[in-house]
């Protein structure tokens, strides 16, 4: 959402979020690290091209033309500098001048050593308990953001992991149309459109970098869960990893896992949609998970097959009109899981990414809640690995990622909601090892084992 330094009346009224880096001569003397040439405060560029007609409520949603409703000036960082105040490096770079390339490796969770597995689980738990050092979340829509008295900004601190959950919730929430009116639900800034892969890529990258900083460990990387096993069991659902099934309640996580202690955020959907409030940092009930337990829907009781990945990687076109969840012969819609693995759209099909979520049959299967189950991280790193392999095979051909007329939030140059600083879909449509500083150690069915660099 927004840097803590910008969650105040003055910044909101001015529409300027250009925090100081090293204000040695007092506040406002080093916006965006300008004194050391790292960046400068500039006008925000937001996509103004038309979106598809799915969304008929222009002017009603704070997420439109993100982030212009809140801020119209922000930091533009030079060279490889990055961050809300240009105080960090772009992904894949390090050093005082951000001029040295680095590469971290995302590996299969099951291939990690016992020590590495334990470190990952501990790190996730630490992220759940550690206040995010930079960002705060809005708990009210823009019209109520200054509170009942017009003088109290409605922002809250939130943990590193819950921030990851909140950003996902904010991207999928309904559009509030007013008290007494039903909120509009046919809107999603991160799913059912071309931005699905780029949005989730940045989402993971943000969490990974937040955890690297939290641990002071630049090599820290998020592992993946190869969910394309064709099995009816969750192989990462063991107590040393993501938690086994509780013996006392088959929809809960075993008390032997730290994740049984986790409590979810953003579960009060009815309240948000009727009162027009936003999810806040308050935690509620436990994670629910019942892998392969949806007996009323046999099609989601088994995970995708290995050959489903092979087939989807043969779909050469990134996306196809109408750039939605009914696109056919679209790689994006295929890996997202609304089309069959061959690429053919079938309204009855749930495959790949969608099937893995639905297989979990609980918190992880509900879009507004799903990141609350940390398996979400592993599921999406694997989805991102498939995306990166597609980018590698087809030379990151962005030509079919639409510049306009995609669902709102999904145009190529749209700033992904609600990430800060503003970042477009285009910036994530690149091969990760060369451009984003990470690679996957992965073996695709029928291929040699490689690090994807």
């Amino acid at each position: 959402q927004f840097p803590r330094e910008c969650a105040n009346i003055e910044a909101l009224r001015r529409g300027v979020c250009c925090p100081d880096l090293l204000p040695s001569s007092g506040p406002g003397t080093d916006p965006c690290g300008s004194s050391s040439g790292r960046g400068r405060c500039v006008a925000v560029i937001a996509d103004s091209r038309p979106h598809s007609r799915h969304y008929p409520h222009d002017g009603k949603d704070d997420r439109e033309a993100w982030p212009l409703r809140f801020f119209n000036r922000t930091c533009q960082c030079n060279d490889n500098f990055s961050g809300h105040n240009c105080g960090t490096c772009r992904p894949g770079w390090r050093g005082a001048a951000c001029n040295q390339k680095i590469l971290t490796v995302r590996r299969n969770l099951l291939d990690l050593s016992p020590e590495e597995k334990s470190h990952f689980v501990r790190a996730l738990d630490m992220a759940k308990r550690t206040t995010h050092p930079q960002f705060v979340i809005a708990t009210r829509r823009l019209e109520d953001i200054l509170g009942p008295d017009g003088n109290t900004p409605q922002f809250e601190n939130i943990s590193v992991y819950n921030y990851f959950v909140w950003t996902h919730y904010y991207s999928v929430k309904k559009t509030f149309l007013g008290t007494g009116q039903e909120s509009f639900g046919d809107v999603d800034f991160s799913h059912e459109g071309p931005a699905f892969l780029t949005w989730h890529r940045y989402h993971l990258l943000q969490l990974e970098r937040d955890m690297q900083e939290m641990l002071q460990e630049p090599s820290f990387s998020l592992p993946y869960w190869n969910f394309a096993t064709g099995k009816n069991v969750c192989d990462v659902c063991t107590d040393d990893l993501m938690g086994s099934r509780s013996n006392f309640d088959s929809t809960l996580i075993s008390p032997n896992s730290v994740f049984s202690q986790w409590r979810v955020v953003c579960e009060s959907l009815e309240e948000y949609d009727t009162l027009g409030t936003l999810c806040n940092s308050t935690e509620g009930g436990p994670i629910r998970r019942n892998p392969a337990g949806n007996v009323g829907r046999p099609a989601v009781q088994r995970l995708p097959e290995p050959q489903d990945v092979t087939q989807c990687l043969e779909v050469r076109v990134f996306d196809t009109p109408p750039f939605y969840s009914n696109s056919t012969d679209s790689f994006r819609n295929t890996v997202e899981g609304y089309s069959a693995p061959t690429g053919k759209y079938d309204p009855a099909v749930r495959s790949l990414h969608n099937l893995a979520h639905l297989f979990l049959n609980g918190t992880g299967g509900q879009t507004h809640l799903s990141p609350n189950d940390p398996i979400f991280v592993l599921l999406h790193t694997f989805t991102d690995a498939v995306f990166d392999e597609w980018l590698r095979r087809y030379n990151a051909d962005i030509s079919t990622f639409p510049l306009e007329n995609a669902p709102i939030g999904h145009n190529r140059q749209y700033n992904m909601v609600p990430f800060w600083p503003p970042v477009t879909n285009t910036e994530m449509f690149v091969t990760a090892p060369d451009n984003l500083g990470y690679a996957y150690e992965v073996q695709w069915p029928g291929q040699e084992f490689t690090v994807s660099e």
Partner: antibody, heavy 120, light 107 residues
């Protein structure tokens, strides 16, 4: 002036526990990660772990997990290392040291004078 | 875990000479490396961080270099006060291990 002042030498029995302190001055410990390092007699340096005093987060080298425990008191700008289940192998000098909060800077830039712990 | 192999274990040189100490990491540590000097009975003292940046107040006869897995500390125009133990330490991945140390003796 940045200083890390460590507590005095300790002579402890095997199996006992000991709590070492490191009082800092010249900087706010909330802005730095505090690390601890061990040096056995005539041996090299061994990294034990770090604490982020701002939130109490800790990380340990797996070989010290369970025997070392780091805590901080931000009101007195002091960090502590508690060692339990001591054996003669734990006879060493223990150093506290700080790392710049900006994690891009790879260095422990200021060190305490060390505390000698003798297990006998 | 990243292992740091430091060499030589000890060396002896005369005032005015140049010596080089090396550290080899078991994996790429991307310049996340520091060098320290420790005199007998004293605390370690930071010399170099980020593999090649001299810490404040450190004489320019000390210099760090290297990349990837291979790093070195060069001391030119040796002075008597340069005697002591030298250690490298990486900060790439947890745990942040040290090299085994090099004992430098001035003849």
């Amino acid at each position: 002036e940045v200083q890390l002042q460590q507590s005095g030498a300790e002579l402890v029995r095997p199996g006992a526990l000991v709590k070492l302190s490191c009082k800092t001055s010249g900087f706010n410990i909330k802005d730095y990660f505090l690390h601890w390092v061990r040096q056995r007699p005539d041996q090299g340096l061994e990294w034990i772990g770090w604490i982020n005093p701002d939130n109490g987060n800790t990380v340990y080298d797996p070989k010290f997990q369970g025997t070392a425990s780091l805590t901080a008191d931000t009101s007195s700008n002091t960090v502590y290392l508690q060692l339990s289940g001591l054996t003669s192998e734990d006879t060493a000098v223990y150093f506290c040291t700080r790392r710049d909060y900006t994690y891009e800077k790879a260095a422990l830039d200021y060190w305490g004078q060390g505390t000698t712990v003798t297990v006998s | 875990d990243i292992q740091m192999s430091q060499s030589p274990a000890s060396l002896s040189a005369s005032v005015g000479e140049t010596v080089t100490i090396t550290c080899r990491a078991s994996g790429n540590i991307y310049n996340y490396l520091a060098w320290y000097q420790q005199k007998q009975g004293k605390s370690p003292h930071l010399l170099v961080y980020d593999a090649k940046t001299l810490a404040d107040g450190v004489p320019s006869r000390f210099s760090g270099s290297g990349s990837g897995t291979q790093y070195s500390l060069k001391i030119s125009s040796l002075q008597t006060e340069d005697s002591g133990n030298y250690y490298c330490q990486h900060f790439w991945s947890l745990p942040f291990t040290f090299g085994s140390g090099t004992k430098l003796e001035i003849k």
